[in-house]
Amino acid sequence: GSVKVLHEPSCFSDYISTSVCQWKMDHPTNCSAELRLSYQLDFMGSENHTCVPENREDSVCVCSMPIDDAVEADVYQLDLWAGQQLLWSGSFQPSKHVKPRTPGNLTVHPNISHTWLLMWTNPYPTENHLHSELTYMVNVSNDNDPEDFKVYNVTYMGPTLRLAASTLKSGASYSARVRAWAQTYNSTWSDWSPSTTWLNYYEPWEQHL
């Protein structure tokens, strides 16, 4: 039977080393056996490269393409093949489709004056364009109360957040996770970091009396 693409490839770049494209076929497909995504930088002398896709779901394929440190002018020609049959052709400009890397190593430390210090690592090296462009969203939620959650936007440079213990329920277990985006690149949000959990042992002032 003929092979058809249901949802054409959607691609994002981490703007440092990898671009990922995902698409959906019209029926369950063994992506790695049946399909190939070729990509070539639109630059004089560049070579054609081939990405072997993997299955994300029965009919969803994903391809991770190693790219050089991206620059704004880079444009890739993409061609999706099923054997000799060209299923889809398009172009992709990494700088226009940025999905930042996930922030790492989220930790929570008790700090002075009944505050918690949340720290994480910027996923980009200092020399990368995105290092100084990231802002973050931190989600803090009560593990036992789905309605008790807070969202903090960290728009300053440092990957830290100070949290007053008094803003959280005493004795409750909380989890935090963080994600990043790059405003100047009009990026999408990164994936959420793994959660880190801690016990908020702050004692309210009234109980102290």
Partner: antibody
Framework: EVQLVESGGDLVKPGGSLRLSCVAS????????MTWVRQAPGKGLQWVSL????????YYADAVKGRFTISRDNAKNTLYLQMNSLRAEDTAVYYC??????????????????WGQGTLVTVSS | DIVMTQTPLSLSVSPGETASISCRSS???????????LDWYLQKPGQSPQGLIY???KRASGVPDRFSGSGSGTDFTLRISRVEANDTGVYYC?????????FGQGTKLEIK
């Protein structure tokens, strides 16, 4: 030591054909794009054609498009220029040169960093 | 096509002086920060061309530091300090950004 040795230049009549060769040594030939550049007597340099490392992508100057074909044999470390429908204005010394490194996603550029000694093509009746 | 224009077309300099050659392109040769696809070549009398400068300012292997390239976008300069008799020849700029690759007309440097 990098060496490029061109051959195949000759006196040929207008409308005739010629095949130039350039044998390379001293570097990993398949990793680099190669170019042909020509120089008419007493004139400046004129780029003719470029081929990437795999041979999968070729580029031509408008003056030779449709008449000249650049190719390479990476097993023999040899670059070729097939010249058909030759005209008097194709008379020149033809140089081959090593160009950008194309095995990376974005070619690494060093300019035309090594040149051959040139081979003379004369088109005259 | 990108047009490359060199000035002057000829230059006469005394040994030990500095020679400057200008090259202007009809379109920007800046692909990304620090990457101007502009080269300088020297063709000595009776010889093949040789690379001097690539990416606007990077010296090719074995080229003395008397040769320096500068500029960005559309305006570039080759400077040869402490000129020697051996520097005589024709200097060409060339854009390596897009097909067709194009050379300047050449600047003939004569040593007095």
């Amino acid at each position: 030591e990098v060496q490029l040795v061109e051959s195949g230049g000759d006196l040929v009549k207008p409308g005739g054909s010629l095949r130039l060769s350039c044998v390379a040594s001293g570097f990993t030939f398949r990793d680099y794009a190669m170019t042909w550049v020509r120089q008419a007597p007493g004139k400046g340099l004129q780029w003719v054609s470029l081929i990437n490392g795999s041979g999968g992508k070729t580029y031509y100057a408008d003056a030779v498009k449709g008449r000249f074909t650049i190719s390479r044999d990476n097993a023999k470390n040899t670059l070729y220029l097939q010249m058909n429908s030759l005209r008097a204005e194709d008379t020149a010394v033809y140089y081959c040169a090593v160009d950008r490194l194309t095995k990376t996603i974005r070619p690494q550029y060093y300019g035309m960093w090594s040149w051959g000694q040139g081979t003379l093509v004369t088109v005259s009746s | 096509d990108i047009v490359m224009t060199q000035t002057p077309l000829s230059l006469s300099v005394s040994p030990g002086e500095t020679a400057s050659i200008s090259c202007r392109s009809s379109q920007s040769l800046l692909y990304s920060i620090g990457y101007n696809y502009l080269d300088w070549y020297l063709q000595k009398p009776g010889q093949s061309p040789q690379g001097l400068i690539y990416l606007g300012s990077k010296r090719a292997s074995g080229v003395p530091d008397r040769f320096s390239g500068s500029g960005s976008g559309t305006d570039f300069t080759l400077r040869i300090s402490r000129v020697e008799a051996n520097d005589t020849g024709v200097y060409y700029c060339m854009q390596g950004l897009q097909s067709p690759l194009t050379f300047g007309q050449g600047t003939k440097l004569e040593i007095k």
